[in-house]
């Protein structure tokens, strides 16, 4: 199946919050929206 990137983003934000509260770590934002077409073998430009 395909990966739901919105779920990945939600999960990442949860881990980011946990890292800040438990380990005093700051994780900068990452973009998960700049992804290729999920069903394509065609490479990006």
């Amino acid at each position: 199946g395909t990966i739901n990137v919105h779920d990945v983003e939600t999960q990442f934000n949860q881990y980011k919050t946990e890292a800040a509260s438990r380990y005093n770590l700051t994780i900068s934002d990452v973009s998960v929206s700049d992804v290729p077409f999920p069903f394509s073998a065609q490479s990006g430009a």
Partner: antibody
């Protein structure tokens, strides 16, 4: 309000060039893949180009590959379509459209009003 | 390329009755439990508007009289009861692979 507004259309001779622009507002432009879709005088809808949210991945149908270039400026909330080596069959209404869906490339959920491109000598 | 066929170019339906618009893909557009077929409405002089996505999901703000069904290669858009404002051309479109392609459209006339 979520809005897309195209500009840059006009009359151009065969073999000529034209650059279309699409100004986006009312949503986080940098979070969405964007596309150009055209509608021929016969009312047929044709996908023209797609660019990922950050501009890394770009896709075209064979009919425009090598002639059209899609690009975006996320700082300016603007999508572009550079068209060259234009042919009569490129005559159409050109729509800017946002791609929505869980995997970012599923359906066109927001459309602009369109800009007309006419290729004729 | 996946060819999308809307076999009925125009359809006349009486006010208050049911309109059924069909769409067929040349190969399956379904995978992993999802059907990558979508429906758009286009009124004269306006851009297309998303009605139904992933075969059966109603887009926000679209009246509940619109519904979509189907999987694999055969899909249907139903409008019931039909209202005057539904006079438009309806297009289906797949996103199962590149290139994305659209059906030729079905023009709905309200009698």
């Amino acid at each position: 309000e979520v809005q897309l507004e195209e500009s840059g259309g006009g009359l151009v001779k065969p073999g000529g060039s034209l650059k279309l622009s699409c100004a986006a507002s009312g949503f986080t432009f940098s979070g969405y893949a964007m596309s150009w879709v055209r509608q021929t005088p016969e009312k047929r809808l044709e996908w023209v180009a797609t660019i990922s949210s950050g501009g890394t991945y770009i896709y075209y149908p064979d009919s425009v590959k090598g002639r059209f270039t899609i690009s975006r400026d996320n700082a300016k909330n603007t999508l572009y379509l550079q068209m060259s080596s234009l042919r009569s069959e490129d005559t159409a209404m050109y729509y800017c459209a946002r791609l929505g869906g869980d995997n970012y490339y599923e359906y066109f959920d927001v459309w602009g009003a369109g800009t007309t491109v006419t290729v004729s000598s | 390329d996946i060819v999308i066929t809307q076999s009925t170019a125009s359809l006349g339906v009486s006010l208050g009755q049911r309109a059924t618009i069909s769409c067929r893909a040349s190969k399956s557009v379904s995978t992993s439990g999802y059907s990558y077929m979508h429906w758009y409405q286009q009124r004269p002089g306006q851009p297309p508007k998303l009605l139904i996505y992933l075969a059966s999901n109603l887009e926000s703000g679209v009246p509940a009289r619109f519904s979509g069904s189907g999987s694999g290669t055969d899909f249907t858009l139903n409008i019931h009861p039909v209202e005057e404002e539904d006079a438009a051309t309806y297009y289906c479109q797949h996103s199962r692979e590149l290139p994305f392609t659209f059906g030729g459209g079905t023009k709905l006339e309200i009698k």
